[in-house]
């Protein structure tokens, strides 16, 4: 297993609809044809897997059907979007990139993106 640098933004604020997007960029040392991207969430020293996808260069990322993540790839950049977020989902979201093929296997883990989620205020009652 060889190490690889992964860069991602330090902070992202989710939209009022609970959607957060960020770019995960990796420094590929070779010409990988199969890349696996995993998003991990770290909160209160607990790390959980949010979503994962393997893509072949030139194709879109394919997440599980019930995944809260979507994404696109362009070269060594992955544009990730996480939806359905609520205030309780605020935390550090870490991008993990694995170059699966061809050998050798490379692994890179970003420093994480702190995603802040603020639940929208309920609309006040209307007299109309």
């Amino acid at each position: 297993c060889k190490a690889m640098h992964v860069a991602q933004p330090a902070v992202v604020l989710a939209s009022s609809r609970g959607i957060a997007s960020f770019v995960c960029e990796y420094a590929s040392p070779g010409k990988a044809t199969e890349v696996r991207v995993t998003v991990l969430r770290q909160a209160d020293s607990q790390v959980t897997e949010v979503c994962a996808a393997t893509y072949m260069m030139g194709n879109e990322l394919t997440f599980l059907d019930d995944s809260i993540c979507t994404g696109t790839s362009s070269g060594n950049q992955v544009n990730l979007t996480i939806q359905g977020l609520r205030a309780m989902d605020t935390g550090l979201y870490i991008c993990k990139v694995e170059l699966m093929y061809p050998p050798p296997y490379y692994l890179g883990i970003g420093n994480g993106t702190q995603i802040y989620v603020i639940d929208p205020e309920p609309c006040p009652d209307s007299d109309f």
């Epitope: 199969e34 996808a53 072949m56 194709n59 394919t62």
Partner: nanobody
Amino acid sequence: AVQLVDSGGGLVQAGGSLRLSCAASGSISSLNAMAWYRQGPGKERELVASITRGGSTAYTDSVKGRFTISRDNAKNTVYLQMNSLKPEDTAVYYCRAVWGFGDYGSWGQGTQVTVSS
């Protein structure tokens, strides 16, 4: 893991066509992606074409407009239609199935394609 069986290779003259098939032992509908790689004499294995679960396709530049990848989920089979073949397409062609959720996927055994000039 799903087992893959490649077939359809053979000897063909330049300009001819071949259709490769990759039959899977189980359902391919949930696979992240399926692809064809090839390895020419003295060369590294290279990605030729891929197709995702959603049907998105991608091709290496040298085969664009000549090769077409497709999948038939009902038959659990992936195809590579190769037209206008060139001598430089000579290689062993391997089918590849990719999961991506804690699995490295599967390879077919390979099928030889030889294009004579």
